[in-house]
Interface confidence: medium
């Protein structure tokens, strides 16, 4: 349904608070370096204009598209050229090229300071102005995560304010706040990674990739829902994500609200687990639906083989309606297997498709495809074996030790990748152990495989910005569903020319002593990556010796009276002993 004024339509649908929040997120995701107050000015200008259009839809400019209105605001920013360089060239383009240009300048790794929560300062800010505090949270997260799912960020901002509402009255603010903020931080990072994968799926592999992912996921969650219903939900959900990934945050949030309403209005035919979600207010409702537990599998489902292996009409079905037939295969497989990872289900569908392509060209197709389910078995066995091996290693080494083992493994596979990226990715991979290995058997595979998909997507996104390894490019671009098996199959790079030993990378100062434990770990792990880049063939024993020497050196100097002097004297000795150990 067309509206005379798109901005008036969205303002009325969303209400002022959500409208302002979403506009702030949009500007913060595009202009990631601008100060908060600058963004607030832009938001207020656009909000006032929206109100004018609500009062009179025929007012000058109200008929303009949201991209035009947003882009015009962005292009008004005085410091655009100095702060953002060639992003300013976008302003010379017309819509829709201008918006595409802004999107292409989003930075997944902006150079912004780490957010360090100081309970007293934050509580003072919260008490002074709750609305501003809410907006500041949206701004800080959005600029660091330029693809964050906007309506979900509104949900987290409300939760964040709720934590301060509760904790700023507590006697020990820190004890109340810090664990809650840390828990939220983990959830926010996971949510950011999930949306980044959705956007990458659409951008790099087309919306069909996201649709397939959603068919599998929703069929697992809603196994009682019929294929027609799942297909409708997938179509609507894909539209929502396409809009958010494309920067159309107002449309995205509006359509997401409509989808939540539809799901709740039709919960009887979708899932028995939605009742509680549907009683909540909008943002909580949408979040709750997204996280809802899987419904029970309907009883007496016929075996998959009946329709997809035994039926003589398989090739007819496949050839006359490929997407619909493969979609129903994915739906039927997924609803029967909540214990499988979505990525594994997609691999099964891909292999099934390849089998039909091959068999349906033969003289006796049925004889060829009738054993297809035996052929698919290895796709389930492979991740199960890998999970067992890695969880055993994790249990033996603990999280930090497991991270270090992964640093060694991945630096040897792709030593060209930048050290900060290798450290970040390996640390995240190591956390999979803590997150997934403790889960019951039925939840291990989806937890592990799907979490790994998020981390490897992060690697792919960072690597795309500055490509240095053909192997990484190949694994990232060839097949979305086979990324993890592709990285698992990589062997140590024998063509790599080791880096020269750089003493600067092993020069430390007294500031290391006051770092939080996590930061200390990162310093050590950075040194480990650099060692491996210098000596990729170093044995486990050599690496162990060097790292033990390094820890002893840091402990000794941090215990010294004159720490800086100790680092100055002992540092060069460490360099010599390291080179000797690796000789």
């Amino acid at each position: 349904d067309t509206h005379k004024s798109e901005i008036a339509h969205r303002f009325k649908d969303l209400g002022e608070e959500h409208f302002k929040g979403l506009v702030l997120i949009a500007f913060s995701q595009y202009l990631q370096q601008c100060p908060f107050d600058e963004h607030v000015k832009l938001v207020n200008e656009l909000t006032e204009f929206a109100k004018t259009c609500v009062a009179d839809e025929s007012h000058a400019g109200c008929e303009k598209s949201l991209h035009t209105l947003f882009g015009d605001e962005l292009c008004k920013v005085a410091s655009l050229r100095e702060t953002y360089g060639d992003m300013a060239d976008c302003c010379e383009k017309q819509e829709p090229e201008r918006n595409e240009c802004f999107l292409s300048h989003k930075d997944d790794s902006p150079d912004l300071p780490k957010l360090k929560p100081d309970p007293n300062t934050l509580c003072d800010e919260f008490k002074a102005d709750e609305k501003k505090f809410w907006g500041k949270y949206l701004y800080e997260i959005a600029r660091r995560h330029p693809y964050f799912y906007a309506p979900e960020l509104l949900y987290y901002a409300n939760k964040y304010n709720g934590v301060f509402q509760e904790c700023c009255q507590a006697e020990d603010k820190g004890a109340c706040l810090l664990p809650k903020i840390e828990t939220m931080r983990e959830k926010v990072l996971a949510s950011s990674a999930r949306q980044r994968l959705r956007c990458a799926s659409i951008q790099k592999f087309g919306e069909r990739a996201l649709k397939a992912w959603s068919v599998a996921r929703l069929s697992q969650k809603f196994p009682k829902a019929e294929f027609v219903e799942v297909t409708k939900l997938v179509t609507d959900l894909t539209k929502v994500h396409k809009e958010c990934c494309h920067g159309d945050l107002l449309e995205c949030a509006d359509d997401r609200a409509d989808l939540a309403k539809y799901i709740c209005d039709n919960q009887d035919t979708i899932s028995s687990k939605l009742k509680e979600c549907c009683d909540k207010p909008l943002l909580e409702k949408s979040h709750c639906i997204a996280e809802v537990e899987k419904d029970a599998i309907p009883e007496n489902l016929p075996p998959l083989t009946a329709d997809f292996a035994e039926d003589k009409d398989v090739c007819k079905n496949y050839q006359e309606a490929k997407d619909a037939f493969l979609g129903s295969f994915l739906y039927e497989y997924s609803r029967r297997h909540p214990e499988y990872a979505v990525s594994v289900l997609l691999r099964l569908a891909k292999e099934y498709e390849a089998t039909l392509e091959e068999c349906c060209a033969k003289d006796d197709p049925h004889a060829c495809y009738s054993t297809v389910f035996d052929k698919l078995k290895h796709l389930v066995d492979e991740p199960q074996n890998l999970i067992k091996q890695n969880c055993d290693q994790f249990e033996k080494l603990g999280e930090y030790g497991f991270q270090n083992a992964l640093i060694v493994r991945y630096t040897r596979k792709v030593p060209q990748v930048s050290t900060p990226t290798l450290v970040e990715v390996s640390r995240s991979l190591g956390k999979v152990g803590t997150r997934c290995c403790t889960k019951p058997e039925s939840e291990r595979m989806p937890c592990t495989e799907d979490y790994l998909s998020l981390i490897l997507n992060r690697l792919c996104v960072l690597h795309e910005k500055t490509p240095v390894s053909e192997k990484v490019t190949k694994c990232c671009t060839e097949s979305l569903v086979n990324r993890r098996p592709c990285f698992s199959a990589l062997t140590p790079d024998e063509t790599y020319v080791p880096k020269a030993f750089d003493e600067k990378l092993f020069t430390f100062h007294a500031d290391i002593c006051t770092l939080p434990d996590t930061e200390k770990q990162i310093k050590k792990q950075t040194a480990l990556v650099e060692l491996l880049k210098h000596k990729p063939k170093a044995t486990e024993e050599q690496l162990k010796t060097v790292m033990e020497n390094f820890v002893a050196f840091v402990d000794k100097c941090c215990a010294a009276d004159d720490k800086e002097a100790c680092f100055a004297v002992e540092g060069p000795k460490l360099v010599v002993s390291t080179q000797t150990a690796l000789a």
Epitope: V228, D311, E320, A321
Partner: nanobody, 126 residues
């Protein structure tokens, strides 16, 4: 829930024609795989013809190919079976069956259809 109601059966001479109808309620007929089965006295229920939902892929048993045509009218929510060149061996009770939530796949296996009509008798005799 899907309710199915067949009509149009009767007595017809060999070589004659009949058109069976199956009115569906509780479900849009274009959203579900539907089929006609038949059961002759003392015999197993057998697949006659089927049509996928969402996509109009039709299926026929070899014994009726070229003589029978399955179709549906979505606006009337009704399934049809046009039977021409009828033979005495076509004598049977004809049943309409539905497989909701399966918009594509029509199976020839009766057990895979959860919803059935009460049947309509077709007698081909001179």
């Amino acid at each position: 829930e899907v309710q199915l109601l067949e009509s149009g059966g009767g007595l017809v001479q060999p070589g004659g024609s009949l058109r069976l109808s199956c009115a569906a309620s509780g479900r849009y007929i274009d959203e579900t795989a539907v089929a006609w089965f038949r059961q002759a006295p003392g015999k197993e229920r057998e697949f006659v013809a089927g049509i996928g939902g969402g996509v109009d892929i039709t299926y026929y048993a070899d014994s009726v190919k070229g003589r029978f045509t399955i179709s549906r009218d979505n606006s009337k929510n009704t399934l049809y079976l046009q039977m021409n060149s009828l033979r005495p061996e076509d004598t049977a009770v004809y049943y309409c069956a539905a497989r909701p939530g399966r918009p594509l796949i029509t199976s020839k296996v009766a057990d895979l259809y959860p919803y059935w009509g009460q049947g309509t008798l077709v007698t081909v005799s001179s």
